[in-house]
């Protein structure tokens, strides 16, 4: 039940995140707020009005609007959070989950072709789950996952982009080919 | 997993005083409001009263404000309620209960107070 | 004190069937938060309440989705999906929006 309330939330690997909470204000009702890492239960960090800020770690942050920052994203910040808010009485103010996902950024796309082979590739080195997409003149050709491989028949002059992306990242690289009719490197 | 273990109970003289103890465990006590509850037989169940964290604030049910006293020890992970001038109509199974996400999550098995002379 | 009327307080059920509980406020219990602490508890047989629902429709960890809790205002109602044989007790709803928390005088499940 609480994964399917989550809200999905991409960060990119090494980069830092902030988990802010929709919808919320701070006031002055506010006495409690934490945030809690749901895979092994534990508290990660808290504020308590008149006490010191809680954070489990240093690559922890809380914001005094709640907003939980995470600094230098590692695979296994990968997880469900979850925060609570409480008021002066003791009530659930709110509750919120986070289902933190967590993606390598995508590299430069390489652009290599031979005139010979009337071959181009478009090719993603690294990057979690990329999406290539090759592009003529601005006419989409073709969507793939690492690697793209076109071929043509006729002689051959375009401009030729290839964008790489996923949910945190998106590089692109255009190329001029030219290739004459019987085709040389 | 959370546990929360009441004594203290029993057979008690109208007029007379009593301590009800609440130990807790699987979970960090000190994180969180705890509240008492008492059930009758054949009466709605009574929330009588709860306190916070740290100790610093209680809130009571207002019948029962001036008998009654919520108080914890959050080094004994240990909730308390005293009862003073006790009355046959405080005859009841007490109930501790963690708060959060509601206000009574997780209770205790009860302990049965009887007020008779 | 805000009363909670609960009905049926008996309720007769087949195992399998849906199974409804009705709990009416005296007064709305939408807190100046906008929040409403409307909270479903079962007591079985010889065992302490168990929390169910919170905030009027949020399950408690554990509780089978077959538990479903809806309402606003002051009119409440806990649904029971495909009613189980661990399902049979005493139901209670319970208000934490104004003090003193009150509870309902129960409805108790029991097989048809």
């Known amino acids: 039940k609480e994964i399917t309330n989550a809200l999905e939330t991409w960060g990119a690997l090494g980069q830092d995140i902030n988990l802010d909470i929709p919808s919320f204000q701070m006031s002055d009702d506010i006495d409690d707020i934490k945030w809690e890492k749901t895979s092994d239960k534990k508290k990660i960090a808290q504020f308590r009005k008149e006490k010191e800020t809680f954070k489990e770690k240093d690559t922890y942050k809380l914001f005094k609007n709640g907003t939980l920052k995470i600094k230098h994203l590692k695979t296994d910040d990968q997880d469900i959070y979850k925060v609570s808010i409480y008021d002066t009485k003791g009530k659930n103010v709110l509750e919120k989950i986070f289902d933190l996902k967590i993606q390598e950024r995508v590299s430069k796309p390489k652009i290599s072709w031979t005139c010979i082979n009337t071959t181009l590739t478009c090719e993603v080195m690294n990057g979690t789950d990329p999406e290539l997409n090759l592009y003529q003149d601005g006419k989409h050709l073709k969507l793939s996952q690492r690697v793209i491989t076109h071929k043509w028949t006729t002689s051959l002059s375009a401009k030729f982009k290839c964008t790489a992306g996923n949910k945190v990242s998106k590089e692109s690289s255009v190329e001029p080919v030219s290739c004459p009719e019987k085709g040389l490197d | 997993e959370v546990q929360l273990v009441e004594s203290g109970g029993g057979l008690v003289q109208p007029g007379a005083s009593l301590k009800l103890s609440c130990v807790a465990s699987g979970f960090t006590f000190s994180d969180y409001w705890m509240s008492w509850v008492r059930q009758t037989p054949g009466k709605p169940m009574e929330w009588i009263g709860h306190?916070?964290?740290?100790?610093?604030?209680?809130n009571y049910a207002p019948s029962l404000k001036n008998r009654f006293t919520i108080s914890r020890d959050n080094a004994k992970t240990t909730l308390y309620l005293q009862m003073s001038n006790v009355r046959s109509e405080d005859s009841a199974t007490y109930y501790c209960a963690r708060e959060a996400p509601g206000a009574a999550s997780y209770w205790g098995q009860g302990t049965l107070v009887t007020v008779s002379s | 004190d805000v009363v909670l009327t609960q009905t049926p307080v008996a309720q007769p059920v087949t195992l399998g069937d849906q199974a409804s509980i009705s709990c009416r406020s005296s007064q709305s219990l939408v807190h100046s938060n906008g929040n409403t602490y409307l909270e479903w508890f079962l007591q079985k047989p010889g065992q302490s309440p168990q929390l169910l629902i919170y905030k009027v429709s949020n399950r408690f960890s554990g509780v089978p989705d077959r538990f479903i809790g809806s309402g606003s205002g002051s009119d409440f109602t806990l649904k029971i999906s495909r009613v189980e044989p661990e399902d049979w007790g005493v139901y209670y709803c319970f208000q934490g929006t104004h003090d003193p928390y009150t509870f309902g005088a129960g409805t108790k499940l029991e097989l048809k």
């Open positions: 306190i916070k964290y740290d100790g610093s604030y209680t």
